[in-house]
């Protein structure tokens, strides 16, 4: 296993609709044709997998149908979007990139993006 640099933004604020987007960029050391991207969430020293996708270079990123993540790839850059976030989902979201094929296998883990989610205030009942 060889190490690889990964960069991502330090902080992102989710939209009022609970959507957060960020870029994950990796320093590809060679001609990888198969790449796996995983988003991990770290909160209270617990790390859980949020979503993962494997893609072939030049093809779209495909997450499972029930995934809360969507994404697009462009070269060694992945644009990730996480949906359905609530305030309780605030945490550090870490981008993990693996170059699966051809060998050698490379692994890169970013420093994480702190995503802040603020639940919208419910609208007060209005009397007309």
């Amino acid at each position: 296993c060889k190490a690889m640099h990964v960069a991502q933004p330090a902080v992102v604020l989710a939209s009022s609709r609970g959507i957060a987007s960020f870029v994950c960029e990796y320093a590809s050391p060679g001609k990888a044709t198969e790449v796996r991207v995983t988003v991990l969430r770290q909160a209270d020293s617990q790390v859980t997998e949020v979503c993962a996708a494997t893609y072939m270079m030049g093809n779209e990123l495909t997450f499972l149908d029930d995934s809360i993540c969507t994404g697009t790839s462009s070269g060694n850059q992945v644009n990730l979007t996480i949906q359905g976030l609530r305030a309780m989902d605030t945490g550090l979201y870490i981008c993990k990139v693996e170059l699966m094929y051809p060998p050698p296998y490379y692994l890169g883990i970013g420093n994480g993006t702190q995503i802040y989610v603020i639940d919208p205030e419910p609208c007060p009942d209005s009397d007309f």
């Epitope: 590809s28 001609k31 060694n76």
Partner: nanobody
């Protein structure tokens, strides 16, 4: 749109040195990571070096590490490849390529670059 033009190639003796330049005649290069590649006759294109947008991150394959150095001058819109102790096997057409990135990293994979120059010929021979 960024357009790349390589220069600085030529005939050099074994053990000699060259400095190649990659200049942009379109957009400013500072939003782009830049890579250098070469293609020798009858061989696949080979990665040589890359440099991130700010110049703080560079990467090289083991085959040229210590002999080739990539630098950039964003004020001059130019990326350089300094090559020393050249060998006959360094002969080929040298290309620079650019990729617009958000952060400071770069890639050694030709698959990641979408803009390429026309190339400059380097011949190492006595």
């Amino acid at each position: 749109q960024v357009q790349l033009v390589e220069s600085g190639g030529g005939l050099v003796q074994p053990g000699g040195s060259l400095r190649l330049s990659c200049a942009s005649s379109g957009d400013t290069l500072e939003s782009f990571a830049v890579g250098w590649f070469r293609q020798a006759p009858g061989k696949e294109r080979e990665e040589l070096a890359c440099i991130g947008r700010t110049g703080e991150f560079t990467d090289y394959p083991g085959s040229v590490k210590g002999r080739f150095t990539i630098t950039r001058d964003n004020a001059k819109n130019t990326v350089y490849l300094e090559m020393v102790n050249l060998k006959a096997e360094d002969t080929g057409v040298y290309y620079c390529a650019a990729e617009r990135l958000v952060f400071h990293l770069c890639s050694l994979s030709e698959y990641d670059y979408d803009t390429w120059g026309q190339g400059t010929q380097v011949t190492v021979s006595s």
